[in-house]
Interface confidence: medium
C-alpha cells in the first residue's frame, strides 16, 4: 500500500520544531492514547479536581472527542487506546459503577483499553457486568488467568491481545496488568496475576507466527515495567502505558507537569531496537499523541508526538456534552442522600486536628485500613495495617445533631480536594523521620501533625525538634492475633496515606524521597462513604493512639496545657 | 548491550582509601538501583548497600555504614563506592550490580568486579 | 538480620540426574503474596549471573532445566536434569528486609 503524507494539524508540527515526512515504502500509525483517566469524565480544574472557572478547565469526555474526531479527520491510520484504570476516583464511578466508561468509551469509539488494577475495585462482578459485558471495543490483559469457575464465565470476555485492522495493515495489541493488583484493588482468588514479562513473551510470539509484524504493549503496570517491557519482550515495536501517572513531553511543557523524560522515552532493546515508551499523565487532562513510521517488514523507523492538552482553547463537544449533562442528573441526587448515621460529634476541627488525636481522623484511617483488606495470604491477617494522614487534610467536622445523617455532600467538606488513598511501601526508618517531622514546629497549628491507624506513637515535645518521638509502635501484619510491636528501622513495612504525603506535600520530602514502591489508590471520599455505608452507625473515639509525655508527667501537663492555650491563642488571632 | 564496567584490580596500602567505579551502558542509568557486594576469596557474598542513580538516596549495610560510602555522577553514567581506612579483611572482589524496578530488585545484571588487595 | 541458610553446603550429581539445593530463612521473606527470594550461579573466576526471581521466575536465557519454588521460610532450586555445564556454586538472596542477605552458597560437581 502507497500511505498519505501525514496531515498533522499545523501547530503541532511546529511545536515538534520539524515538520517530518514519512520515508518511501514507510507505513505511518498515529496512536493516540489515555490512561489513568480516574472517572473525570466531565471537565477539571487545572488540578484535575472539580471545574470552577469554566473557561480554565481542561479534559473530560466532550473535550477529548472532539480532539480525537480531528486527528480522525485528518490522518489516515489512527488508534484510539486506552492503558487502564477508567474506573475509581469521583461520584461518577460511586453511582454508575463502571456503567459510565463503557458508554462514554464506547460513545468516543476506543479501539482497545488495556485493564488497570482499579477495573477490580468493585470485585470481578463488578467489571464483567458493566464493563466487560457492554463495551464494544477489545479489553485485555495478558497476564491476567482465571481458574476455577471463573474461567468459564469470563472466557472471551478479555482477550490476551488483539489484532486490528488499521488501513490496509494490521496491528497486534498485547495487553497487560501490574502483577501487584491482588494487593491494590479485589479481584478475588479465582485470577492469577502473572509475572508481565513471562506472560507476554509467547503471546508477542504467537502474533509473530501470525505474520503480525507491528505490535504494541499496551498497559497498566508503572513506568519502570513499561520501560522493562520495551527492554526485554521481543517483538514489541510501541508501549503504552499508564499507573505511574508519568508525564512524558518534548519541548516546553504547556502545564504545570514536569515531564519525567522525553515523549516518547526511548528504550534500547535488548536485541538492539529503538522501543519507543508512553504514558499521558492522568484524569484525562492530555491526549497522548505519537505517530509512528514502520518499515515494510514492521520495524519501527521513526516514533514522534506529544501529549496534547486539553484546555478550554479546544471547544467540548456538543453530543457528548448533552450525554454527559443527562447523566449528570442522578449524581446530584446522590450526593444529598444518606449514606450512614453518627452518633457522635465527629471532630474535623484544625484546633484538634493539627494538635491532637482527633475521632475524624481515627474514622478515615480506619476507612483507609478497611478498604485495603486483602486476605492474600495466611501468614498474614492483613498485608497493610498502618495509615498516616496529615490533620491539615481534614477541612471540616460533621455534627451530630442533624438527626447523625452524614452525605457524601458532608464529606466533601471533609475531604474536598479530589486526592486518592495510597499505598506505599517504607523503610521504618523513613517512617521515623516522617514522625519526627510531624511535631517538629507543634503548636503552630501547621498541617503536618500526623492523625495515625495501626499506630501507636508517643511524643515528648520537652525535648529538641528530630528527637521527640519517644516511643512508636505498629500493628503487626504477620500474626493471628494483631497487636502492637516497636517499628524496626531497616524493615520494610505498607502504609496506606494521602497521595498528597506520597509526594512529598507538607514537608513530608522524606517520604517520597524514600519511599520504595508506591501504587495509587481509591478516591479518599470513596474510601469514607464507603466505610460508613458498610457500618452503617458510626462512633469513632479518641483512644490513645497519639500520646504526649515527658520525663515527669507534672511537667508533661504543664507542657501541654500551656502549648495548647498557646495554639487556641494562635488560632484566634489568625 | 547493558554492561557495567569496572577496573580489574586496586592495590593500595593498609590505612589508605581507594575508590572503585563502575560504568554502566546499554540502559536508562537512572531507572536502575545500583548495589555493591563484596567477596572475599573463598567466601560467599556480602551485600554492602545500594544508591538511587537518579536522586543519590542510599540504604547501607550497618555492618559498611562506616566502611562504605556511595556515590553517583549521572552525567557519566557511573555509580562509585569509596571505602575507607583499609585492612587485609577489605581484600576482596567488589561487585557493583544492576537492581530491578520496585521492591523485588533481584541484581539481573553485575559487573565484573574490581579486586582489592590491601598490602603493604 | 535475616540469615539464610543454604544446604547442602557442596553436592555431587550424576550427568543427567537431579539437583535440589535448599535454601532456609531465619524468618519469612514472603510479603503477604509473592516471596523476595532470588537464586544466583557463580562459576569460578566469574561475576554471579541471575538464575531465578521472585522464587519461582526464570530469568530470560536460563534454560528451563531450572526451577525454583518454596515460600514463607523454606525455598528450594531444583536443577533436572543436571548438565556438565551447571558445575558452580549457587546462592540464594533475600530482600524482605534490609540489609539484603545471601546464603553461604552450595558447590556443585558433576560426577
Known amino acids: 500500500m502507497c500511505p498519505r503524507a501525514a496531515r498533522a494539524p499545523a501547530t503541532l508540527l511546529l511545536a515538534l520544531g520539524a515538520v517530518l515526512w514519512p520515508a518511501a515504502g514507510a507505513w505511518e500509525l498515529t496512536i493516540l492514547h489515555t490512561n489513568d483517566v480516574h472517572s473525570r469524565l466531565e471537565q477539571t480544574s487545572e488540578d484535575s479536581s472539580k471545574c470552577v472557572n469554566a473557561s480554565r478547565c481542561m479534559g473530560g469526555v466532550a473535550r477529548l472527542f472532539t480532539k480525537v474526531q480531528q486527528i480522525r479527520r485528518a490522518e489516515p491510520n489512527v488508534l484510539l487506546l486506552d492503558a487502564g484504570d477508567q474506573y475509581q476516583g469521583t461520584i461518577w464511578f460511586t453511582v454508575y459503577k463502571g456503567a459510565e466508561v463503557a458508554h462514554f468509551m464506547n460513545a468516543l469509539r476506543y479501539d482497545a483499553m488495556a485493564l488497570g488494577n482499579h477495573e477490580f475495585d468493585n470485585g470481578v462482578e463488578g467489571l464483567i457486568e458493566p464493563l466487560l459485558k457492554e463495551a464494544k471495543f477489545p479489553i485485555l490483559s495478558a497476564n491476567i488467568k482465571a481458574k476455577g469457575p471463573l474461567a468459564s464465565q469470563i472466557s472471551g470476555l478479555y482477550l490476551p491481545y488483539k489484532v486490528l485492522p488499521v488501513g490496509d495493515e494490521v496491528v497486534g495489541i498485547v495487553g497487560y496488568t501490574s502483577k501487584e493488583t491482588p494487593f491494590l484493588s479485589n479481584p478475588g482468588t479465582n485470577l492469577v496475576f502473572e509475572d508481565e514479562i513471562t506472560a507476554l513473551q509467547p503471546e508477542v510470539d504467537k502474533l509473530k507466527t501470525l505474520n503480525v509484524n507491528k505490535i504494541i504493549a499496551l498497559g497498566h503496570s508503572g513506568f519502570e515495567m513499561d520501560k522493562l517491557i520495551a527492554q526485554k519482550v521481543r517483538g514489541v515495536d510501541v508501549v503504552v502505558g499508564g499507573h505511574s501517572n508519568t508525564f512524558l513531553y518534548t519541548g516546553n511543557p504547556p502545564s504545570k507537569e514536569v515531564p519525567a523524560g522525553k515523549y516518547p522515552f526511548i528504550v534500547t532493546s535488548d536485541d538492539g531496537r529503538k522501543v519507543p515508551v508512553v504514558q499521558a499523565y492522568a484524569f484525562g487532562k492530555y491526549l497522548g499523541y505519537l505517530k509512528i513510521e514502520f518499515d515494510e517488514r514492521g520495524n519501527v523507523i521513526s516514533s514522534h508526538g506529544n501529549p496534547i492538552l486539553l484546555n478550554s482553547s479546544i471547544p467540548e463537544d456538543p453530543s457528548i456534552k448533552a450525554d454527559i449533562n443527562k447523566w449528570r442528573i442522578k449524581l446530584d441526587n446522590y450526593s444529598t442522600q444518606e449514606l450512614g448515621k453518627t452518633i457522635v460529634y465527629l471532630d474535623g476541627s484544625s484546633q484538634s486536628c493539627r494538635f491532637r488525636e482527633c475521632n475524624m481522623g481515627n474514622l478515615i484511617c480506619d476507612a483507609m485500613i478497611n478498604n485495603n483488606l486483602r486476605h492474600t495470604d495466611e501468614m498474614f491477617w492483613n498485608h497493610v495495617s498502618m495509615c498516616i494522614l496529615n490533620g491539615g487534610g481534614i477541612r471540616s467536622p460533621i455534627d451530630e445533631r442533624n438527626n447523625g445523617t452524614i452525605t457524601w455532600e458532608n464529606l466533601a467538606a471533609v475531604l474536598p480536594f479530589g486526592g486518592t488513598f495510597d499505598l506505599v511501601q517504607l523503610k521504618g526508618s523513613t517512617l521515623k523521620k516522617a514522625f519526627e517531622h510531624s511535631v517538629h514546629r507543634y503548636g503552630q497549628s501547621t498541617g503536618e501533625f500526623l492523625q495515625v491507624g495501626g499506630i501507636h506513637v508517643v511524643y515528648d515535645l520537652s525535648r529538641k525538634p528530630g528527637d521527640r518521638v519517644v516511643k512508636l509502635d505498629v500493628l503487626c501484619t504477620k500474626c493471628r492475633v494483631p497487636s502492637y510491636d516497636p517499628l524496626k528501622m531497616d524493615e520494610v513495612y505498607k502504609v496506606i496515606l494521602p497521595n498528597f504525603l506520597a509526594n512529598g506535600g507538607d514537608g513530608f520530602q522524606m517520604i517520597k524521597d524514600e519511599l520504595l514502591r508506591h501504587d495509587s489508590g481509591d478516591q479518599d471520599i470513596n474510601v469514607v462513604s464507603t466505610y460508613i455505608s458498610k457500618m452503617k452507625v458510626i462512633y469513632p473515639a479518641v483512644e490513645g493512639r497519639i500520646k504526649f509525655s515527658t520525663g515527669s508527667h507534672c511537667h508533661g501537663s504543664f507542657s501541654l496545657i500551656f502549648l495548647s492555650l498557646w495554639a487556641v491563642i494562635f488560632v484566634l488571632y489568625q | 548491550q547493558v554492561q557495567l564496567q569496572q577496573p580489574g584490580t586496586e592495590l593500595v596500602k593498609p590505612g589508605a582509601s581507594v575508590k572503585l567505579s563502575c560504568k554502566a551502558s546499554g540502559y536508562t542509568f537512572t531507572s536502575y538501583w545500583m548495589h555493591w557486594v563484596k567477596q572475599r576469596p573463598g567466601q560467599g557474598l556480602e551485600w554492602i548497600g545500594n544508591i538511587n542513580p537518579s536522586n543519590g538516596g542510599t540504604n547501607y549495610n550497618q555492618k559498611f555504614k562506616s566502611k562504605a560510602t556511595l556515590t553517583v555522577d549521572k552525567s557519566s553514567n557511573t555509580a562509585s563506592m569509596q571505602l575507607s581506612s583499609l585492612t587485609s579483611e577489605d581484600s576482596a572482589v567488589y561487585y557493583c550490580?544492576?537492581?530491578?524496578?520496585?521492591?523485588?530488585?533481584?541484581?539481573?545484571?553485575w559487573g565484573t568486579g574490581t579486586t582489592v588487595t590491601v598490602s603493604s | 538480620d535475616i540469615v539464610l541458610t543454604q544446604s547442602p553446603a557442596s553436592l555431587a550429581v550424576s550427568l543427567g540426574q537431579r539437583a535440589i539445593i535448599s535454601c532456609k530463612a531465619s524468618?519469612?521473606?514472603?510479603?503477604?503474596?509473592?516471596?523476595?527470594m532470588h537464586w544466583y550461579q557463580q562459576k569460578p573466576g566469574q561475576q554471579p549471573k541471575l538464575l531465578i526471581y521472585r522464587t519461582s521466575n526464570l530469568e530470560a536465557g536460563v534454560p528451563t532445566r531450572f526451577s525454583g519454588s518454596g515460600s514463607g521460610t523454606d525455598f528450594t532450586l531444583n536443577i533436572h536434569p543436571v548438565e556438565e555445564d551447571d558445575a558452580a556454586t549457587y546462592y540464594c538472596q533475600q530482600n524482605r528486609e534490609f540489609p539484603w542477605t545471601f546464603g553461604g552458597g552450595t558447590k556443585l560437581e558433576i560426577k
Open positions: 524468618q519469612s521473606v514472603s510479603f503477604a503474596g509473592p516471596s523476595l
Open positions: 550490580a544492576r537492581g530491578d524496578y520496585g521492591y523485588d530488585w533481584y541484581l539481573d545484571v
